[in-house]
């Protein structure tokens, strides 16, 4: 792959350059000082001169006036002001607002439900395969294999709690040691961040929205990947997570607690259980090498069963095979013993759509995968539309200021930590980091939350999901309590360690810069987002898995050269941006490489060729749907469905994304045309709440 996308005629710029104050700020900037605000109350930002040592020298000449794509958009309010309305108008507007709120909550409900169904669909499609990943004996000795198994399994079942509960049951059954379980937990942490990245893909329609949404989602991915990159070798070398958690578990005499409260599930379960119900024990049984489980279906058929535990007499070859000497007898010819047998009597069938279809798991999973993605996409579009119409003018200003403004000096640094607590608290309430971060994604997309503010919220979400796991561990039965608690604590301390690495010092907030860089690339080349998803969550883990199966020698033989090349490229990039003069003239830029190795443009041409035909067809369909939609809602200007068609023409435009040095991954200048920004819709009579 290209060392960096778009490095065409890059020339190091030795001169200092101008950059928006908001640009480099790792914490959320004060939006009252933001650029491109139309509100005349807000002063334009003063440009600050930054030395290359802080921000890195650009690889191309930049214009002095930069229109930062990361600045939050101002949603113009074209409606009649509240004060100018008559009584009838005010009442109408009030009920319109109530209606929108109900609609928003409704779509949000179905959005969360579709995430749950999506998880079930993934489990049906890949759950058994995921279970089989765990039954690999090499996990014990190879932490890298454990890591990728954690990633793959969590991606396949779309639930880190499912993969961690499998790990817990394997540890409590002595099939796995805590030491071997830690890399799997790290992998599960990575795997769980795919959900909100998928959700971000749903906002692909609008370039600027997609840029923000995708960056906001992938900030979670980068945090997890970077944390693992640093902490896995540290853990392998020192076993600090294992030691700390062991000390904690041994020093406290924990009593079995109660289950963590299911707050969100209480609302969503009545609906989701009508769609499908799964027997998640099957995956765990496969992971624990239960041969019978391999032929079991994950789709739950019987919901009400009567389990009768009885002791039956069975013959045994000799008294040595008896359950115990006191439970051994003879009938004069054969030896007998008493065995505990559980008779399961099916009483009532489950009440879900697939209960009587008797379809294979793959078929049910595929159906649900398609449907849940459609619902997810539809709900997301509607949520964004409703939020777009509600969050306008002063409402948007108030909300944005509340969320994105820091505490007054000298407590500004505390804001991020409060955001971490809020993220943890919210995740604890909804009982799922995927749900919380997925709900956050469209808000980042439409510009309500900055990436700088979303980052600590996401980190808090990572902590929140581990506190849920700790509570669940405390509710475990006696034999599983120690192992499940230790694993939950490992997960907790791993995330704490990650936060300490990538949050307290603004300079170390690499995930934000990397996510913004990826956001810029993906906004320009939208196929790259899917490519990134496949590479990072499937291909790399599967490659490592395959190489690990081949043995240590193969893994090292392939891995070391790859790692060496990556380090070489990164060092070269660093030198190119920081001190290019120390390099030979040829190495001061990437022009010595063929275009396909330094730019995504040739790749884009290939992808466009493949998708062009499909895109055209999709576009016609989209236009037809759109016209119908617009006629129904009687708003000829509100519908931007056919945007994809405009993008087809837009794709022909020749401008490339100028890319800067590695560590400024942000502030990449992209024209408004490339951003695909469009003015806010001016529908008939929009309400302004304030």
């Amino acid at each position: 792959m290209a060392p960096w996308p778009e490095l065409g005629d890059a020339q190091p710029n030795p001169d200092k350059y101008l950059e928006g104050a908001a640009g480099q700020q790792p914490t959320a900037p004060d939006k009252s000082k933001e650029t491109n605000k139309t509100d005349n109350t807000e002063a334009p930002v003063t440009k600050i001169e930054l030395l290359p040592s802080y921000s890195t020298a650009t690889l191309i000449d930049e214009p002095t006036e930069v229109d930062d794509p990361w600045n939050l958009p101002t949603l113009q309010d074209s409606g009649i002001k509240w004060s100018e309305r008559d009584t009838k108008g005010k009442i109408l507007c009030f009920f319109q607002g109530i209606g929108r709120l109900i609609l928003l909550l409704g779509f949000l409900y179905f959005f969360v439900c579709s995430l749950d169904i999506l998880s079930s669909a993934f489990q049906l499609v890949g759950g058994k395969m995921a279970g089989q990943f765990f039954s690999n004996s090499s996990i014990m000795s190879n932490p890298l294999l454990g890591l990728v198994i954690g990633v793959l399994v969590t991606v396949l079942v779309q639930s880190s709690s499912t993969s961690t509960s499998i790990v817990v049951s394997m540890v409590s059954s002595s099939l796995l040691t805590v030491r071997a379980a830690i890399p799997i937990i790290m992998g599960a942490n990575i795997g769980t961040s795919i959900t909100n990245t998928i959700v971000a893909l749903m906002q692909v329609g609008d370039r600027s929205e997609f840029r923000r949404a995708f960056a906001g989602a992938t900030v979670h991915d980068f945090f997890n990947w970077l944390s693992v990159l640093v902490l896995l070798p540290v853990e392998v070398a020192t076993h600090y997570l294992e030691i700390i958690t062991q000390l904690i578990v041994e020093s406290f005499h924990f009593k079995n607690g109660e289950d963590a409260p299911d707050l969100l599930k209480v609302i969503t379960k009545p609906f989701t259980k009508l769609i499908v119900q799964l027997d998640k024990k099957v995956i765990s049984q496969i992971a624990m090498n239960d041969e019978k489980a391999k032929n079991k279906s994950l789709v739950k058929i019987w919901c009400k069963t009567f389990t009768n535990k009885t002791q039956i007499n069975v013959t045994v070859p000799s008294t040595a095979n008896c359950t115990s000497p006191s439970l051994c007898w003879t009938d004069g010819i054969q030896n007998w013993t008493m065995k505990n047998v559980t008779y399961k009597e099916n009483i009532a069938k489950c009440q879900h759509i697939f209960v009587n279809f008797h379809l294979p798991d793959l078929a049910v999973g595929t159906i649900l995968l398609i449907l849940s993605l459609l619902v997810l996409c539809g709900c997301l579009i509607m949520i964004v539309k409703i939020l777009g119409s509600v969050l306008k003018g002063q409402v948007a200003t108030v909300i944005k200021k509340t969320i994105n403004t820091d505490f007054p000096f000298p407590f500004a640094w505390l804001t991020g930590y409060l955001a971490i607590l809020v993220g943890a608290g919210m995740t604890f309430i909804v009982q799922s980091s995927s749900v919380f971060t997925s709900a956050l994604t469209p808000l980042i997309g439409i510009g309500v939350i900055t990436i700088e503010r979303a980052y600590p919220l996401t980190l808090g979400s990572n902590i929140g999901t581990t506190t849920t796991a700790i509570l669940a561990a405390l509710a475990s039965p006696g034999n599983a309590l120690r192992s499940s608690l230790q694993i939950a604590l490992c997960h907790f301390f791993f995330n704490i360690s990650g936060i300490l690495l990538w949050y307290p010092i603004p300079f170390t907030r690499l995930p934000i810069r990397m996510a913004k860089g990826l956001g810029n690339i993906s906004a320009k080349y939208r196929w790259f987002a899917v490519f990134y998803l496949i590479i990072f969550f499937f291909l790399i883990p599967l490659t490592v898995f395959g190489l690990s199966l081949a043995g240590w020698r193969v893994l090292v033989g392939v891995g070391v050269p790859v790692v060496f090349i990556i380090i070489l490229v990164l060092c070269l990039r660093l030198l190119q941006s920081r001190c290019p003069r120390v390099l030979p003239k040829k190495l001061q830029n990437w022009n010595f490489l063929p275009l396909w190795m330094r730019s995504l443009k040739p790749w884009d041409a290939v992808v466009s060729k493949f998708t062009g035909c499909f895109q055209m067809r999709c576009c016609c369909c989209c236009r037809v749907c759109c016209r119908a939609c617009c006629l129904l809602c009687d708003c000829p200007k509100c519908c931007r469905c056919s945007k994809c068609c405009e993008d087809l023409e837009e794709a022909q435009e020749g401008q490339d994304v100028p890319v800067k040095a590695p560590e400024t991954f942000d502030n990449i200048t992209i024209s408004r045309e490339a951003q695909g920004e469009v003015p806010a819709s001016d529908s008939k009579t929009e309400c302004t709440a304030l």
Partner: antibody, heavy 119, light 107 residues
Framework: QVQLVQSGAEVVKPGASVKMSCKTS????????MHWVKQAPGQGLEWIGA????????AYNQKFKGRATLTADKSTSTAYMELSSLRSEATAVYYC????????????WGQGTSVTVSS | DIQLTQSPSFLSASVGDRVTITCKAS??????VAWYQQKPGKSPKLLIY???TRHSGVPDRFSGSGSGTEFTFTISSLQPEDFATYFC?????????FGQGTKLEIK
Amino acid sequence: QVQLVQSGAEVVKPGASVKMSCKTSGYTFTTNNMHWVKQAPGQGLEWIGAIYPGSGATAYNQKFKGRATLTADKSTSTAYMELSSLRSEATAVYYCARGMYGHGAMDYWGQGTSVTVSS
Amino acid sequence: DIQLTQSPSFLSASVGDRVTITCKASQDVGTAVAWYQQKPGKSPKLLIYWATTRHSGVPDRFSGSGSGTEFTFTISSLQPEDFATYFCQQYSSNPLTFGQGTKLEIK
């Protein structure tokens, strides 16, 4: 009802053999073990062995192995015990008893066959 | 072989009395113990199996208890027809063995 009817008394000379029968009725002959128990005059009970008529499997008390042979005829629902090389201490009442399914308690007993070994 | 020792060997009691017979096994037999009643000139009759379970048709004045190596057989209120010889039997392992018997006589 379950009934076990044994053959009549036998008087035999030392060294000779004797074969006694136990005809059953009132239950499925092949599902329960058939035990044979010896009771010498004024003595306690002594287990000789058992046969499972369903398969013909047998088990013997080591003390009687080689001198007692247990057989069963499924067609007539009859169990047999043959005692060979009889000595005077073999004088006793021999009972056949039905074993309860799955364990060694004997719920129904025959009336007994008296064997007297005398020269 | 597992030895069973019954005590007492002889027992004199009156109608209405409560009578207890014990049976000790030379090793752990769990609860694989049965109790039989035998009247003179008759074949034995099963009363109790699994140490405590009464056989069908056996009056509830007969009861059994114990596990492991010590077992007791109790007649809560002696009736005239209860005077007979009582045997314990283990079926924990082959060969099946019986106690030497306890003869219950009228006082």
